[in-house]
Interface confidence: low
C-alpha cells in the first residue's frame, strides 16, 4: 500500500506580513494528480475556502483583495487526488500591520554608537500594548520579541544592546501589538539607522560588507545582552 | 461624536427588496467594518453582514444568497439590500459600526450603533 | 459555522447579588469575543470585547474572562438598572455569530 500523499507547499505573496488594505495571494502547491485543494484557517470553520487546481493542476490560488484583521491568522491547506486526501502542509502566518497606530523607535543615548559600547533602542506606543518587535532590515531572523508577563500592559518596550560590534549597524523599525493577537501588529514605526562607528582595532565595514550574503553575519538572529528592563517585560526571540 | 442613522422604507411587500442606508455622521467610513444586524420583534440578535470601507463584503451564510452590502465612501453612508423578502424577515433593522483597531479601543465589538429602523413585511 | 450558545437563557437575582452568565462556542476563538447588553426597547450596548476589555464608560461591577471555547459575564453587585438581555458575540472570523441572549430580571 502507497504511503500518505505527500504534503503540499503554501506560501504568500507578495509575502506574510502585509499592511492592512493590500492584497495578499495564498498559494498552495501539491502534485498534478490534484483534485481539489482547501485552505484551512485556524479558529475557523473548515473548510476556509476551497479551490480547483490551476493548469497544470499542481497549485491553487487563494486572493484576499484586501487585507483586514479577519484574514490575518494561521493557515493550512491540503489537495485531495483520486486516492484521497494530503497531509497538511506546513502552516503559514498570516500577519497584518496597520492595525494599531506607529510606535516611536528611539536609541539612547543616540543612534551613533562606538563598537564595543551600549546602546538602548526604546520603542515607545501611545497607548498600553503588551507585545513590542523590533525588526532589522536584510536579517534573516528580523523579530526580537519583549512580551509582558501577566497581561499587564506598557507604554514602552527597551532592547538593549552590549557591546556594540559592526553588525548590529542597520536600520530598524518596530512594532507593536496586543497579546491576544500576535498575528495583527501596529504600523511600523519610523526607521531608525544605527551607526556603528569603529575603533583602529574595529573599523567600521563598508556599505559592500554590511549587506546581507547567504552566510553572513546578518544572518545569525539578534540577540541583544544585557538585562531584561523593569518594565514587566519578557524577552523572546524568534 | 460618530452617529449612524438608518433610514429606509418601514413597509416592504413579500418578493420584494428590502433597501436600507446608514448614514455615518461624526466621522469617517474609512478604517472600521461597517455591520448590518437585525432583530425579529422579541427575538434575539442576528448578524447579517459587514463592509469594509474597501468594499470587501462578508455575509451571513444563512442570507447571504439575498444580500448585498454597498458603500459610497464619498456620501459616507452603506446600504443593505435584502431580496425576495417574507414575512420571517420582518424585523427592526440596525446598522453598527465595529470598533477596528485604530485607536478605538473597542478591539472588535460593535461599538456605535445606529437607533434601528422597524421593516415590516406585508402586502 | 461556530455556534454560541448562552446560558442561562433567562435568570432572575435580587439587587446585590454576584450575577454570572456563560457563554460557549462550538469551536475556539480565542479571545474574539465581545458582550453587548440591550435594554428594552433600547439599542444594544458594547460592554465588553477581547472577553475581558471593558468599554469605557461601563462600569466596573462588570467583567469577563474566558478564552477558546468558554467565556463568562460577570455582574459583582446586581443593580436595578441592570435589568436586560445580555448578549454575546464571537467575531474572530466572519459570521459574526451571536448568542441567543439571557434575559436578566430582578426578584
Known amino acids: 500500500q502507497a504511503g500518505p500523499l505527500p504534503k503540499p507547499t503554501l506560501w504568500a505573496e507578495p509575502g506574510s506580513v502585509i499592511s492592512w488594505g493590500n492584497s495578499v495571494t495564498i498559494w498552495c502547491q501539491g502534485t498534478l494528480e490534484a483534485r481539489e485543494y482547501r485552505l484551512d484557517k485556524e479558529e475557523s470553520p473548515a473548510p476556509w475556502d476551497r479551490q480547483n487546481p490551476l493548469e497544470p493542476k499542481n497549485k491553487a490560488r487563494f486572493s484576499i483583495p484586501s487585507m483586514t484583521e479577519d484574514y490575518a491568522g494561521r493557515y493550512r491547506c491540503y489537495y485531495r487526488s483520486p486516492v484521497g486526501w494530503s497531509q497538511p502542509s506546513d502552516p503559514l502566518e498570516l500577519v497584518m500591520t496597520g492595525a494599531y497606530s506607529k510606535p516611536t523607535l528611539s536609541a539612547l543615548p543616540s543612534p551613533l554608537v562606538t563598537s564595543g559600547k551600549s546602546v538602548t533602542l526604546l520603542c515607545q506606543s501611545r497607548s498600553p500594548m503588551d507585545t513590542f518587535l523590533l525588526i532589522k532590515e536584510r536579517a534573516a531572523h528580523p523579530l526580537l520579541h519583549l512580551r509582558s508577563e501577566h497581561g499587564a500592559q506598557q507604554h514602552q518596550a527597551e532592547f538593549p544592546m552590549s557591546p556594540v560590534t559592526s553588525v548590529h549597524g542597520g536600520t530598524y523599525r518596530c512594532f507593536s501589538s496586543h497579546g491576544f493577537s500576535h498575528y495583527l501588529l501596529s504600523h511600523p514605526s519610523d526607521p531608525l539607522e544605527l551607526i556603528v562607528s569603529g575603533s583602529l582595532e574595529d573599523p567600521r565595514p563598508s556599505p559592500t560588507r554590511s549587506v546581507s550574503t547567504a552566510a553572513g553575519p546578518e544572518d545569525q538572529p539578534l540577540m541583544p545582552t544585557g538585562s531584561v528592563p523593569h518594565s514587566g517585560l519578557r524577552r523572546h526571540w524568534e | 461624536q460618530v452617529q449612524l442613522q438608518e433610514s429606509g422604507p418601514g413597509l416592504v411587500n413579500p418578493s420584494k427588496t428590502l433597501s436600507l442606508t446608514c448614514t455615518v455622521s461624526g466621522g469617517s467610513i474609512s478604517s472600521y467594518f461597517w455591520s448590518w444586524i437585525r432583530q425579529p420583534p422579541g427575538k434575539g440578535l442576528e448578524w447579517i453582514g459587514y463592509i469594509y470601507d474597501s468594499g470587501s463584503t462578508n455575509y451571513n451564510p444563512s442570507l447571504k444568497s439575498r444580500v448585498t452590502i454597498s458603500v459610497d465612501t464619498s456620501k459616507n453612508h452603506f446600504s443593505l439590500k435584502l431580496s425576495s423578502v417574507t414575512a420571517a424577515d420582518t424585523a427592526v433593522y440596525y446598522c453598527?459600526?465595529?470598533?477596528?483597531?485604530?485607536?478605538?479601543?473597542?478591539?472588535?465589538?460593535?461599538?456605535?450603533w445606529g437607533q434601528g429602523t422597524t421593516v415590516t413585511v406585508s402586502s | 459555522d461556530i455556534q454560541m450558545t448562552q446560558s442561562p437563557s433567562s435568570l432572575s437575582a435580587s439587587v446585590g447579588d454576584r450575577v454570572t452568565i456563560t457563554c460557549r462556542a462550538s469551536?475556539?476563538?480565542?479571545?474574539?469575543l465581545a458582550w453587548y447588553q440591550q435594554k428594552p426597547g433600547k439599542v444594544p450596548k458594547l460592554l465588553i470585547s477581547a472577553a475581558s476589555t471593558l468599554q469605557s464608560g461601563v462600569p466596573s461591577r462588570f467583567s469577563g474572562s474566558g478564552s477558546g471555547t468558554d467565556f463568562t459575564l460577570t455582574i459583582s453587585s446586581l443593580q436595578p438598572e441592570d435589568v436586560a438581555t445580555y448578549y454575546c458575540q464571537k467575531y474572530n472570523s466572519a459570521p459574526w455569530t451571536f448568542g441567543q441572549g439571557t434575559k436578566l430580571e430582578i426578584k
Open positions: 469551536q475556539g476563538i480565542s479571545n474574539y
Open positions: 453598527a459600526r465595529r470598533g477596528g483597531y485604530y485607536g478605538s479601543g473597542s478591539y472588535g465589538g460593535m461599538d456605535v
